[in-house]
């Protein structure tokens, strides 16, 4: 709290200039008035205050806005938004883009701080809905935006914004996540031809389900190791041999590095060492041939 | 965190001259460049000069003409030259920055005495 006191004679500010960088903090407190620098606001991120000095102007918009600043002033906070907690971002109404722009861009290559996780959150619940303006302008200041959100909040993304995500923006994801995602990107790049189809759902594969991986299968799409090891093995484990191998392509020799990590360990118990041996790459630990394979997953379901 | 250290205070009579040194001990990442503050006894804290970025120079009223900033990136110091000092002047003179995460930053101080 900075201490009430007379300003001193001719040192009432008249606007919002650099002068102000020589006040103390109790003239800044004393002789700027909180209207004035409401309507002028737009000048202070190009004066070189300290951070004590933003201090005392926050202390003067907080006494002249306790309800919350309002969007004219918000947007041209500048270095001032990293004064502000959590609890003064909740008293905002944040709806322009523009608004949100320009305060990301104080945080810019720094981690999401809780100020700027509040002020995404009050952004993103007053418009109802992630919509691919605001997705595109999220990923591009924190790629690992997406995935930081709950599958449930997830589920307000619509398949239109799905355009906007860069495969790093799903380095993070887990599969809770990409289960979500994977059907709003199916639905999102219906239209496209297979190989531009692969090449787009390609990051959202760990949400894909058998099928679609047998469909993928049969389109000759070279599926790299990397993709493959961060499918759902409950996806991968009943793809046969003959599926994994048009689905991998050239791919398909690195099973050999992977045998003994999920879903290439669990994947090989499933199969008939025989099947496995067609592929010559020396996979052990299949079947044994004259087994017989029960699915009792199966049989459970038919009686 | 990078440190700053003042250096270059004494006592000095009225109409002399000081130099004010202030050595980084690395890189900084300022917002608002690099200033020379002051905080006489019983008073408040009061910016006299600051060097922006972009090597723009701004100074209190009370000290233009007199004082100059100026700095020397190779060797990561910023000077204070104080000429013809007043008895007004004394203070302890600090150095300091604001990064771009809301942060400033001082260094210990140097102690300037303008007296006869």
């Known amino acids: 709290e900075v201490e009430k006191t007379a300003c001193p004679s001719g040192k009432k500010a008249r606007e919002i200039d650099e002068s102000l960088i020589f006040y103390k903090k109790w003239e800044l407190e004393a002789c700027v008035d909180a209207a004035l620098l409401a309507t002028q606001m737009d000048r202070v991120n190009a004066i070189p205050f300290t951070y004590e000095q933003l201090d005392v102007l926050k202390h003067k918009l907080d006494e002249l806005y306790p309800q919350g600043y309002p969007e004219s002033v918000i947007q041209h906070l500048g270095y001032l938004f990293l004064k502000m907690s959590p609890e003064d971002i909740r008293k905002w109404n944040v709806t322009s883009l523009e608004t949100l722009k320009a305060l990301l861009e104080v945080n810019k290559g720094h981690e999401m701080s809780p100020q700027v996780a509040t002020l995404i959150d009050r952004f993103v619940k007053g418009r109802g809905q992630l919509d691919k303006d605001t997705l595109d302008t999220l990923t591009a200041f924190y790629p690992g935006y997406l995935c930081s959100l709950s599958p449930e909040e997830l589920s307000s993304v619509p398949p239109s914004s799905i355009w906007a995500v860069r495969p790093q923006d799903l380095d993070t994801c887990d599969p809770r996540q990409l289960d979500v995602l994977y059907p709003k990107a199916r639905l999102a790049f219906q239209n496209m031809n297979g190989s531009e189809y692969f090449v787009k759902i390609q990051s959202f594969l760990g949400g894909a389900p058998t099928e679609d991986l047998k469909a993928l299968s049969q389109q000759n799409v070279s599926m790299d190791l990397a993709t493959f090891m961060k499918l759902r093995t409950d996806a991968v484990l009943p793809l046969t041999v003959a599926e994994v191998q048009k689905l991998l392509g050239p791919h398909v020799e690195g099973l050999k590095a992977e045998e003994r990590h999920r879903p290439v360990r669990d994947w090989i118990l499933r199969q008939r060492q025989d099947d496995l041996d067609t592929l010559g790459l020396g996979l052990q630990g299949g079947i044994p041939n004259g087994y017989l394979v029960l699915d009792l997953s199966m049989q459970e379901a038919l009686s | 965190q990078v440190q700053l250290v003042e250096s270059g205070g004494g006592v000095v009579q009225p109409g002399g001259s000081l130099r004010l040194s202030c050595a980084t001990s690395?890189?900084?990442?300022?917002?608002?460049?690099m200033g020379w503050f002051r905080q006489a006894p019983g008073k408040g804290l009061e910016l006299v000069a600051r060097?922006?970025?972009?090597?723009?120079?701004m100074y209190a009223d009370s000290v233009k003409g007199r004082f100059t900033i100026s700095r020397d990136n190779s060797k990561n110091t910023v000077y204070l030259q104080m000429n013809s000092l007043k008895p007004e002047d004394t203070a302890v003179y600090y150095c300091?920055?604001?990064?771009?995460?809301?942060?400033?930053?001082w260094g210990q101080g140097t102690q300037v005495t303008v007296s006869s």
């Open positions: 300091g920055y604001s990064d771009y995460r809301g942060t400033d930053y």
């Open positions: 690395g890189t900084i990442f300022s917002r608002n460049g």
């Open positions: 060097i922006l970025n972009d090597g723009t120079t």
